[in-house]
């Protein structure tokens, strides 16, 4: 059966979310990658994407989001700086592979941003640092819009997963900007 797993990040306003999406296969290194938010009842929305082809260690900044693709490690680093309460939600990384539909990277990120003191977090297991320096040179990339008219769409079910969920951190699936409804046996 398909595993839809997510990992929970609980942060304070003003802190930085700093996560990595593992894309496993070298063939994906140059593929364009994107950071999306999945809001209840809506289609996944692309917030930022890398260039096409994706460049190694080259920061791309869109507003408060910085993407950096590390080909040598098979990882896409995503940072969201100066977090706001309204940033709370479910996020995912995807890989664009035209003419094929995009691939989704796991884990999904369940971000919970709360008001309060945004000093150095106390728990190493459950938090990220809030200190962040803007990269000296960043590029803004244009993100393609993928649609699949014949795809039935629906927001994915809300998961009850939390940090104790086994993490399938590098699992891939075929999705589009309009996500396919998975069929479970």
């Amino acid at each position: 059966a398909t595993k839809l797993t997510e990992e929970k990040y609980e942060l304070k306003e003003g802190q930085t979310l700093d996560v990595k999406c593992d894309y496993t296969l070298e063939k994906f290194a140059s593929s364009q990658k994107a950071w999306q938010i999945i809001r209840d009842g809506e289609m996944p929305k692309t917030l930022a994407c890398t260039e096409r082809p994706s460049k190694n260690s080259h920061p791309v900044q869109v507003g408060r989001i910085i993407l950096e693709d590390y080909h040598d490690h098979g990882l896409l680093r995503v940072r969201m700086v100066n977090l706001q309460v309204e940033d709370s939600g479910l996020y995912q990384c995807v890989i664009y592979q035209p003419p094929k539909e995009p691939h989704m990277l796991f884990d999904r990120i369940r971000l919970v941003v709360t008001k309060g003191f945004s000093g150095t977090p106390g728990s190493n297991e459950n938090s990220t640092q809030n200190v962040y320096k803007i990269p000296p040179t960043t590029t803004k990339a244009l993100c393609p819009l993928y649609t699949s008219p014949r795809t039935v769409t629906q927001a994915p079910p809300k998961s009850t997963a939390d940090v104790s969920t086994p993490d399938s951190e590098i699992n891939l699936t075929n999705v589009t900007d309009i996500i396919r409804v998975p069929v479970f046996n």
Epitope: D72, L75, N124, E125, S168, N171
Partner: antibody, heavy 117, light 111 residues
């Protein structure tokens, strides 16, 4: 050239503590994950845990959770394994490894930890 | 946690022969068409070396005589023609679920 060098291995008594270091060169640890893997004498490999040095987020094997703590100092490009309440069964060569595409691709030479009274 | 069982424990072969090593997982390590199963080689006194990742892809600088296959719970590492330097211990490892786990190893020794 990518290199990982572990240090800090020693002989320690049961119940004691030890901190291992893993110094990286040739890449920035903040751009990847660092894992610790151990190997008891004459035995197989055992994953200990992992850190995302940029975010500080950690994962541990159940056997060491609560006793071992993985940390990292981005500015020193070094990861650490703090081991408390050591047991004789923690005796092993400890390797730090760099992550690449879902695997542990870059390995250090290992450092020996002996827990004995 | 996912338990990986390797077989045989020891494989006695001569240089030039074909080696087939098996790794079985207690539950599937495949998802969305990718198998999160890796193979490592370890020689005495040395650190392990990545051979195969994601079940079938060779690591950097790994000779073509090494190949991997399988999905779900059953995986195979094949060495098409053993070279003298291939006699070592081989471990499978899954990166599908935390904690990551290794098989107990298969020793490939000279017959």
């Amino acid at each position: 050239e990518v290199q990982l060098v572990e240090s800090g291995g020693a002989l320690v008594k049961p119940g004691g503590s030890l901190r291992l270091s893993c110094a990286a060169s040739g890449f920035n640890i903040g751009n990847t994950y660092i894992h610790w893997v151990r190997q008891a004498p004459g035995k197989g490999l055992e994953w200990v845990g992992r850190i995302d040095p940029a975010g500080g987020r950690t994962k541990y094997a159940p056997k060491v959770k609560g006793r071992f703590t993985i940390s990292a100092d981005d500015s020193k490009n070094t990861a650490y394994l703090q081991m408390n309440s050591l047991k004789t069964e923690d005796t092993a060569v400890y390797y730090c490894t760099g992550h690449r595409g879902g695997t542990m691709d870059y390995w250090g030479q290992g450092t020996l930890v002996t827990v004995s009274s | 946690e996912i338990v990986l069982t390797q077989s045989p424990a020891t494989l006695s072969l001569s240089p030039g022969e074909r080696a087939t090593l098996s790794c079985r997982a207690s539950q599937s390590v495949s998802n969305y068409g990718i198998s999160f199963l890796n193979w490592y080689q370890q020689k005495p006194g040395q650190a392990p070396r990545l051979l195969i990742y994601a079940a079938e892809y060779r690591g950097r600088g790994i000779p073509a005589r090494f190949s991997g296959s399988g999905s779900g719970t059953d995986f195979t590492l094949t060495i098409s023609s053993l070279e003298p330097e291939d006699f070592a211990v081989y471990y499978c490892q899954q990166s599908s679920n935390v904690p990551y786990t290794f098989g107990q190893g298969t020793k490939v020794e000279i017959k």
